[in-house]
């Protein structure tokens, strides 16, 4: 998200790990492998973040911005309802869902979309940056 | 334009069981949950369970556990649902209906199927 | 198991008249709400999702809003082809769970 792009922030933008983009106060990192929802959340946990959580509608057009087609795993479940991994509601847009088997959340370029958890798909990660 | 179209009434004596078809028509099939849903007369809407009809997984809410068992042949592309041990509590009309897009709320419906329980 | 609580059972209104039907959850729900119409002998039919997504084909009369636990429909001009009984529905939480249902009449 740095690098002379239009979310550049200021000249502290090294400020994130190598392979992880800042914007604001949080630095992402998406992957290019594919891991199941489980998975991925445990490869950002290791590495002292959390699979991605929106915050609002502002944030998540941002990142569709740098999003392909290709859906990423986000940390989002239904857990009696969609929720965030933080326990917060998702209250600002709506998931495409088939079915109820689907309980795990992805977001590509153009929406939220529920799949089952199993599946492998590339993910974010998000932490505040240093 | 999904249609679904659903078995003919039935009257069945107390004890017995009986299965109940839903036939969709005019999209895939196996993409969306199918619902079952009850509806006594003069009464309002009860959800017995669902389907998903790419894996056969079902959920059936905890007052029909043990009531209604859901299937699906996706070669007819035809959902069934079996009743068992009846009584006169479960006469009534039974919906099938596909889920909507963005989650279980229901955006096409069948006719109905009405079951009388009698002896 | 949230439960839904629809608090009329029947209204009254006259023909060109405002409806508003009320629905009440028992926890939040954050917009994840159905209603749905029924006419005697026929199946419901979706009128919105999301609380004020308005289905394809529904007329602009009926309108959705609410937020929280609390939910109304509104039928801003009654037509005689309205008189039907209305159910909201949750669909936060599994199970989904429906209203009582409000029955519309002409007053």
């Known amino acids: 998200l740095c690098q002379g792009s239009k979310y550049s922030t200021c000249a502290s933008c090294p400020s994130c790990p190598d392979h992880w983009m800042k914007y604001g106060n949080h630095c992402y990192y998406f992957s290019v492998e594919k891991k199941d929802w489980i998975s991925s959340l445990e490869f950002c946990l290791a590495r002292d973040s959390h699979l991605l959580m929106i915050t609002d509608k502002q944030e998540m057009s941002l990142l569709q911005d740098f999003l392909s087609e290709a859906f990423h795993w986000v940390g989002l479940r239904n857990n009696s309802g969609w929720r965030w991994e933080d326990g917060s509601p998702l209250n600002f847009s709506r998931i495409y869902s088939n079915s109820l088997v689907q309980t795990c959340g992805a977001i590509n370029k153009n929406s939220l979309q529920a799949s089952s958890c199993e599946v492998s798909l590339q993910w974010v990660c998000k932490k505040v940056s240093p | 334009q999904v249609h679904l179209q659903q078995s003919g009434p039935e009257l069945v004596k107390p004890g017995a069981s009986v299965k109940l078809s839903c036939k969709a028509s005019?999209?895939?099939?196996?993409?969306?949950?199918i619902t079952w849903v009850k509806q006594r007369p003069g009464q309002g809407l009860e959800w017995i369970g669902w389907?998903?009809?790419?894996?056969?997984?079902?959920q059936n809410s905890e007052k029909f556990k043990d009531k209604a068992t859901l299937t699906v042949d996706t070669s007819s592309t035809t959902a069934y649902m079996e009743l068992h041990s009846l009584t006169s509590e479960d006469s009534a009309v039974y919906f099938c209906?596909?889920?909507?897009?963005?989650?279980?709320?229901?955006?096409?419906w069948g006719q109905g199927s009405t079951l009388t329980v009698s002896s | 198991v949230i439960q839904m609580t629809q608090s009329s059972s029947f209204l009254s209104a006259s023909l060109g008249g405002r409806v508003s039907i009320t629905c009440r959850a028992s926890?939040?729900?954050?917009?994840?709400l159905a209603w749905y119409q029924q006419k005697p002998g026929n199946a419901p039919r979706l009128l919105i999702s999301?609380?004020?997504s308005l289905e394809t084909g529904i007329p602009s009369r009926f309108s959705g809003g609410g937020s929280g636990k609390d939910y109304t429909l509104t039928i801003i001009s009654l037509q005689t082809e309205d008189i039907a009984s209305y159910y909201c529905?949750?669909?936060?939480?599994?199970?989904?769970?429906f209203g009582g249902g409000t029955k519309v009449e002409i007053k």
């Open positions: 209906a596909r889920r909507g897009q963005f989650g279980p709320y229901f955006d096409h």
């Open positions: 005019g999209d895939t099939f196996t993409t969306y949950d």
């Open positions: 389907i998903y009809p790419k894996d056969g997984r079902t």
């Open positions: 926890d939040h729900i954050y917009n994840w």
């Open positions: 999301g609380a004020t």
């Open positions: 529905q949750q669909y936060w939480n599994t199970p989904p769970t």
